[in-house]
C-alpha cells in the first residue's frame, strides 16, 4: 500500500497586493489521522499560517470543506496579501499524538507578491542655478515587488542619458525601492521646461508612473541691462531708461545712482512676460540738467533674486 | 458502497481466528479501517484502527493478541489467545476517528470463544 | 485513557419531544472536537449520526443535532420521530492515536 502523499503543485504563485492568494495542497490518503497544518518557511523559525485542528487565522480560509466527510484537499486562501507574506508555505500532514508529530510535508509553493510602486517623487536643487550650469535630479519610488524596474529621465519629453539608479535592497526583500540621480545642463528657455522621471513596472500594465519637477523652480536667469538716454523731454531735463531684460525669477530691485549717489530704489512690479517665460522690466529716470555744472554719471544698478548687483552706467553730457 | 464481514464462529479459549471484511463500491487505500465489537447486550467498543504499513493502533487491552492488515480491498483482523470475554459481534467500519469517523459498517460477525 | 460517561443511560420520550442526551469525557477529547455520535437499532450495526462534535453527516435528518467542546457534549433530536427510538453512543478521541472510547450509550425508549 502507498504512503499518504503531500502534493503541493505549484512550486509558485503570484499575486498582486490586495487580492487574496490560493495555495493548493492535497492529500492523497486520510491516514493517519491528524491534521494538516501550513507554514511559512522551513526550519524551526518557521511560522505557523492555518492549523486544521485549532486556533484563529482571521485571514485564511479553506478553500474546501474542511470538515467534509473524505476531503482530502487541504487548499487555503490568504487574504489582503501584502509584500510581507511572500515566501515559500509548506503544507504539512501531521499524525495525531500527544503532542501531534510530523507525518509528512509538500514540496513547498513560492508566493510572490507584486506590489505597486509609489509615485515618483521627483527634487530638484535647493537653490537656484544659472543658464549653463549642471544640476541634479532626484526620482524616488518604493515599495514594489518584484524588484525589476524600469526607469527613465526625460526633459521636455526628451529622454536624458546622464543619470544613475540604484534599486534596494540588493538582496531578497519583501519590497523595493529605486532611487535615481539624473544631471541637467540648465539653458536661458528652460523657464517653462520640465524634468519628468517615469517608472515602468509589471503591476502597472503598461502604464508607467510620472513625477515630474518644473525648472521654474530651479533656473534663475539672470537680466541683461541696458540704459539709453530719450530725446530731451524739456529744456533742462533728460529722460534716462534702463531696460531690464530676460530675468526669470521676478524679484528684483533697481535703484539709480547719480554720480553715485542714491537717487531712487524700485521694485519690479508691473513687468511683461515673454514667450519663454522670462521677464522684461523698464524703469526711468528723469535727470534735472540745469542741476549739475559737469557731466554726471548715471548708473542702473539691480539686484536679481538676491544676489549680487549688476549695474551699467551711462555718462549724460551738460553743456556749459 | 458496503462492507462485509466473514469469518467469525465458534472459536475454543486460546484458539486464533482470522475476521475478513470485503470492502465493494470504494477503495480501502486512502482509508483507515477500524474494528468494533460488541458483547452480547453491551455496548460499543473500540478495537483498533488499520492504516498502511505501520500506521495501525490498537485499544491497550487488544495489542499483542490482535494484529490488522489490508489490502486495497479487503481488510483483516488476525485474533490469537481468544478468551470468553472476547465473545461479541465484530464490526468492521470505514474510517479512523476524528475528521475521518466510521461512516459505513459491516453486518458484523459474532465471535464466540467457548470451550 | 480518555473515560466516556453517557448520562442519561436511558431516557422514555414520546414523539415529538426533544430529547437532550448528553456525553462527558474524562479529559478534553483531542481538538476539543474528536466527538461522534452513532445511532445502534437492535440486530444492526450502529450508524454515524454526528462527527467533529457538530458536523451532521451526509444523509442524517436535521433534527439531530451536536454541540460541546472539550469535555462537555450534548446530542439533541428537536422533535423525536418513531424511527428514532435506539440507542445512541458517543465516540471520543484523546490524544493519542490508540485512544479511542465509546460511551455506555443511552437507550431512548417509548413513553
Known amino acids: 500500500e502507498e504512503e499518504l502523499q503531500v502534493i503541493q503543485p505549484d512550486k509558485s504563485v503570484s499575486v498582486a497586493a490586495g487580492e487574496s492568494a490560493i495555495l493548493h495542497c492535497t492529500v492523497t490518503s486520510l491516514i493517519p489521522v491528524g491534521p494538516i497544518q501550513w507554514f511559512r518557511g522551513a526550519g524551526p523559525a518557521r511560522e505557523l499560517i492555518y492549523n486544521q485542528k485549532e486556533g484563529h487565522f482571521p485571514r485564511v480560509t479553506t478553500v474546501s470543506e474542511s470538515t467534509k466527510r473524505e476531503n482530502m484537499d487541504f487548499s487555503i486562501s490568504i487574504s489582503n496579501i501584502t509584500p510581507a507574506d511572500a515566501g515559500t508555505y509548506y503544507c504539512v500532514k501531521f499524525r495525531k499524538g500527544s503532542p501531534d508529530t510530523e507525518f509528512k510535508s509538500g514540496a513547498g509553493t513560492e508566493l510572490s507578491v507584486r506590489a505597486k510602486p509609489s509615485a515618483p517623487v521627483v527634487s530638484g536643487p535647493a537653490a537656484r542655478a544659472t543658464p549653463q550650469h549642471t544640476v541634479s535630479f532626484t526620482c524616488e519610488s518604493h515599495g514594489f515587488s518584484p524588484r525589476d524596474i524600469t526607469l527613465k529621465w526625460f526633459k521636455n519629453g526628451n529622454e536624458l542619458s546622464d543619470f544613475q539608479t540604484n534599486v534596494d535592497p540588493v538582496g531578497e526583500s519583501v519590497s523595493y525601492s529605486i532611487h535615481s540621480t539624473a544631471k541637467v545642463v540648465l539653458t536661458r528657455e528652460d523657464v517653462h521646461s520640465q524634468v519628468i522621471c517615469e517608472v515602468a513596472h509589471v503591476t502597472l500594465q503598461g502604464d508607467p508612473l510620472r513625477g515630474t519637477a518644473n525648472l521654474s523652480e530651479t533656473i534663475r536667469v539672470p537680466p541683461t541691462l541696458e540704459v539709453t538716454q530719450q530725446p530731451v523731454r524739456a529744456e533742462n531735463q533728460v529722460n534716462v531708461t534702463c531696460q531690464v531684460r530676460k530675468f526669470y525669477p521676478q524679484r528684483l530691485q533697481l535703484t539709480w545712482l547719480e554720480n553715485g549717489n542714491v537717487s531712487r530704489t524700485e521694485t519690479a512690479s508691473t513687468v511683461t512676460e515673454n514667450k519663454d517665460g522670462t521677464y522684461n522690466w523698464m524703469s526711468w529716470l528723469l535727470v534735472n540738467v540745469s542741476a549739475h555744472r559737469d557731466d554726471v554719471k548715471l548708473t542702473c544698478q539691480v539686484e536679481h533674486d538676491g544676489q549680487p548687483a549688476v549695474s551699467k552706467s551711462h555718462d549724460l553730457k551738460v553743456s556749459a | 458502497r458496503q462492507l462485509v464481514e466473514s469469518g467469525g464462529g465458534l472459536v475454543q479459549p486460546g484458539g486464533s481466528l482470522r475476521l475478513s471484511c470485503a470492502a465493494s463500491g470504494f477503495s480501502l487505500s486512502s482509508h483507515g479501517i477500524s474494528w468494533v465489537r460488541q458483547a452480547p447486550g453491551k455496548g460499543l467498543e473500540w478495537v483498533g484502527t488499520i492504516g498502511t504499513g505501520v500506521i495501525t493502533y490498537y485499544a491497550s487491552w487488544a495489542k499483542g493478541r490482535f494484529t490488522g492488515s489490508k489490502t486495497s480491498s479487503t481488510a483483516y483482523l488476525q485474533m490469537t489467545s481468544l478468551r470468553a470475554e472476547d465473545t461479541a459481534v465484530y464490526y468492521c467500519?470505514?474510517?479512523?476517528?476524528?475528521?475521518?469517523?466510521?461512516?459505513?459498517w459491516g453486518q458484523g460477525t459474532l465471535v464466540t470463544v467457548s470451550s | 485513557d480518555i473515560e466516556m460517561t453517557q448520562s442519561p443511560s436511558s431516557v422514555s420520550a414520546s414523539v415529538g419531544d426533544r430529547v437532550t442526551l448528553t456525553c462527558q469525557a474524562s479529559q478534553s477529547v483531542y481538538g476539543n472536537n474528536d466527538l461522534a455520535w452513532y445511532q445502534q437499532k437492535p440486530g444492526q450495526a450502529p450508524k454515524l449520526l454526528i462527527y467533529l462534535a457538530s458536523t451532521l453527516a451526509t444523509g442524517v435528518p436535521s433534527r439531530f443535532s451536536g454541540s460541546g467542546s472539550g469535555t462537555d457534549f450534548t446530542l439533541t433530536i428537536s422533535s423525536l420521530q418513531p424511527e428514532d427510538f435506539a440507542t445512541y453512543y458517543c465516540?471520543?478521541?484523546?490524544?493519542?492515536?490508540?485512544?479511542?472510547?465509546f460511551g455506555g450509550g443511552t437507550k431512548v425508549e417509548i413513553k
Open positions: 465516540l471520543g478521541g484523546g490524544d493519542d492515536e490508540a485512544d479511542n472510547v
Open positions: 467500519a470505514r474510517g479512523s476517528a476524528w475528521n475521518d469517523p466510521f461512516d459505513y
